[in-house]
């Protein structure tokens, strides 16, 4: 089958870095600078992605893979191959149209980036609140109420009395 | 404009070995790709290495593992070593730094 597709497609038999070329009577040809084809069977090759502004280079083009971006200090990578640049906030703040704002009470984020979130509801679990929230953490949950009443079967029991009159072993 | 002049060829054995040259002179210094292609009696021209604009070297399959693609700046030459010649070898090997062609040289494998 291979040997049929060559025969029958001359582009097939380019590899990658090359294109196939119309100009050259479909001969494979060398990428041209600052261009680059990752298959074989190109008809073209792909203009390199420059990595400018806030966007910095992570890896450099070459003729046979494009160049990959991430983004300057400050900034975070968002979309299918770092498409865009956003800007980092603090933990406790969350990026909106006006800049960086600082989370909302009963609201948290603790990274640089993305939205604050609700803090967790322990009750909904039948849970306590052990350590309150903040705009950077979210709240620890603990035992239950019921957990932490006197009775209760989770409180460990006191040790036995001794005899009286009995030293400690 | 570049011009570029082929040398080395010949009559060689199989398995045996040849060292083509390709002399380049005008304005090579913004060019960036030099390769070779061969062409075989009734078959078309084909790219055979070649040195990307990002400096590496590249073969074709029929190349790959025998041919040596390398270059001197200073002297302005472009060399294929060619090693374990095969009869499929025979052909005239051009040389091209984008845009111009050199004139040919002609390998023949034959035993």
């Known amino acids: 089958f291979e040997r049929t597709r060559s025969l029958q497609d001359p582009c097939s038999n380019c590899p990658a870095g090359t294109f196939c070329d119309n100009n050259r009577n479909q001969i494979c040809s060398p990428c041209p600078p600052n261009s680059f084809s990752s298959a074989g069977g190109q008809r073209t090759c792909d203009i390199c992605r420059q990595c400018k502004g806030v966007f910095r280079t992570r890896k450099e083009c070459s003729s046979t893979s494009n160049a990959e971006c991430d983004c300057t200090p400050g900034f975070h990578c968002l979309g299918a191959g770092c498409s865009m640049c956003e800007q980092d906030c603090k933990q406790g703040q969350e990026l909106t149209k006006k800049g960086c704002k600082d989370c909302c009470f009963g609201t948290f984020n603790d990274q640089k980036r993305g939205i604050c979130r609700p803090w967790t509801n322990c009750s909904l679990d039948g849970k306590s609140v052990l350590v309150n929230g903040t705009k950077e953490r979210d709240v620890v949950c603990g035992p239950s109420p019921a957990d932490l009443s006197p009775g209760a079967s989770s409180v460990t029991p006191p040790a036995p009395a001794r005899e009286p009159g009995h030293s400690p072993q | 404009a570049v011009q570029l002049v082929e040398s080395g060829g010949g009559l060689v054995q199989p398995g045996g070995s040849l060292r083509l040259s390709c002399a380049a002179s005008g304005n090579i210094f913004s060019i960036r790709v030099w390769s070779w292609y061969r062409q075989a009696p009734g078959k078309q021209r084909e790219l055979v290495a070649w040195f990307a604009w990002d400096n590496i070297a590249h073969y074709t399959d029929s190349a790959k593992g025998r041919f040596t693609i390398s270059r001197d700046n200073t002297k302005k030459t472009l060399y294929l070593q060619m090693d374990s010649l095969k009869l499929e070898d025979t052909a005239v090997y051009y040389c091209?730094?984008?845009?111009?062609w050199g004139q040919g040289t002609q390998v023949t494998v034959s035993s």
């Open positions: 091209n730094s984008e845009d111009s």
